[in-house]
């Protein structure tokens, strides 16, 4: 069913990292335009990206209202230049997305090592607490603010002169590790949400090594 000469969207896909969330779909439109609606299970559908020829729609502003809710989006197809036209059933053609729960499914972005500081045989490594687009009381929350203790970081570290890696974990954004005096070490971190069943881990951060500008050394 549906409007003559329009085709339904397909391959509706959520692309989400640190709650920045975009819905993508196919096909590239030929003589048609799209409007997207999004809703929680309440069925209070909100329209976005009106009559667009794009095949993506940024839904971040909607999902950050409550990242624990489960969302569904639907993409309506209309004939270009005649968006009031409907199909034989009096309904425009549409397709539903998969369900999407941001808290459980948004990808964890690549973390960044903010700094490291050596004091004797200990090194304190700090992970940057990235800001998200989730708001509370008119302020943007950090990744740690949103996930709390559900979010851990894994530190991989190794002597610059060898390849044997060690690991450490923290449920804050800081590590305090023991190192051999006089040795330079390299570091990489990964964000992990162990309780998740999908998208549990981020990609590894860029490697940072002692003796470079991010570090500080004190006896």
């Amino acid at each position: 069913s549906g409007t003559t000469n329009t085709v339904a969207a397909y391959n509706l896909t959520w692309k989400s990292t640190n709650f920045k969330t975009i819905l993508e779909w196919e096909p590239k439109p030929v003589n048609q335009v799209y409007t997207v609606q999004i809703s929680t299970k309440s069925g209070d559908w909100k329209s976005k990206c009106f009559y667009t020829t794009d095949t993506e729609c940024d839904l971040t502003d909607e999902i950050v209202k409550d990242v624990n809710q489960t969302y569904l989006a639907r993409v309506f197809s209309y004939p270009a230049g005649n968006v009031e036209s409907t199909g034989s059933a009096g309904e425009p053609l549409y397709e539903n997305s998969p369900e999407f729960t941001p808290y459980l499914e948004t990808n964890l972005g690549q973390p960044t090592i903010q700094s490291f500081e050596q004091v004797g045989t200990k090194v304190n490594v700090t992970v940057e607490d990235e800001r998200t687009l989730v708001r509370r009381n008119n302020t943007f929350l950090s990744l740690r603010d949103v996930f709390g203790k559900d979010l851990i970081y894994t530190l991989y570290y190794w002597k610059s002169s060898s390849s044997g890696k060690k690991t450490a974990k923290t449920n804050t954004n800081e590590f305090l590790i023991d190192v051999d005096k006089g040795e330079n070490y390299c570091f990489s971190v990964q964000a992990v949400i162990p309780s998740r069943t999908v998208n549990r881990k981020s990609t590894d951060s860029p490697v940072e090594c002692m003796g470079q500008e991010k570090g500080e050394f004190r006896e």
Partner: antibody, heavy 118, light 107 residues
């Protein structure tokens, strides 16, 4: 555990009115669309009406438009169906159901019988 | 309105049998279809939504398939508690409509 408990059914004369209630518990009521579905004796299921979580959007089957009104009180976790100008063909068990996105019906009450007869 | 036609209207089978019930929509509804089970004097129970997604708590012997206009509900190995009436429902567009039901009886 999701629980839906209908009440307000009974015997009413043609042309009369009745108000059904559905008390919800075990979930965040305002987060879900809700629906009424009915089943005439010995017959199949018929969707009657749906309402969004905010109450801003309501939908009805053609045969009850203008006679039935669906509403909800989220502060009381209660769904309502005001039925006016009742007809013999409205006789049925009326079920309240939770309706994610206003789509399918994932949890149902036990039903309340409405009999329209003189 | 979209008409939903179920077949067969009734079906006799034995415990352990594999059973398939079909539902046809009068126009395309993509995957916007649900299946319900109802036992005598009881409220319906949700089995399947989005044509093939199993409702939480429903045994895996139940499965759904199809898209567009033709859909099936399959019970891979009938259990005694599965004898009931089954309904399909489209939620593509209002008014939502149900099939007339398929009564599954013990042979």
């Amino acid at each position: 555990e999701v629980q839906l408990l209908e009440s307000g059914g009974g015997l009413v004369q043609p042309g009369g009115s009745l108000r059904l209630s559905c008390a919800a518990s075990g979930f965040t009521f305002s987060n879900y669309a809700m629906s009424w579905v009915r089943q005439a004796p010995g017959k199949g299921l018929e969707w009657v009406s749906s309402i969004s979580g905010s109450g801003d959007y309501t939908y009805y089957t053609d045969s009850v438009k203008g006679r039935f009104t669906i509403s909800r009180d989220n502060s009381k976790n209660t769904l309502y169906l005001q039925m006016n100008s009742l007809r013999a063909e409205d006789t049925a068990v009326y079920y309240c159901a939770r309706s994610p996105w206003g789509y399918y019906l994932d949890s149902w009450g036990q039903g309340t019988l409405v009999t329209v007869s003189s | 309105d979209i008409q939903m036609t179920q077949s067969p209207p009734s079906l006799s089978a034995s415990a352990g049998d594999r059973v398939t019930i079909t539902c046809r929509a009068s126009q395309g509804i993509s995957s916007r279809l649900a299946w319900y089970q109802q036992k005598p004097e009881k409220a319906p129970k949700s089995l399947i939504y989005a044509a093939s997604s199993l409702q939480s708590g429903v045994p895996s012997r139940f499965s759904g398939s199809g898209s567009g206009t033709d859909f099936t509900l399959t019970i891979s190995s009938l259990q005694p508690e599965d004898f009931a009436t089954y309904y399909c429902q489209q939620y593509n567009s209002y008014p939502y409509t149900f099939g007339q039901g398929t009564k599954l009886e013990i042979k």
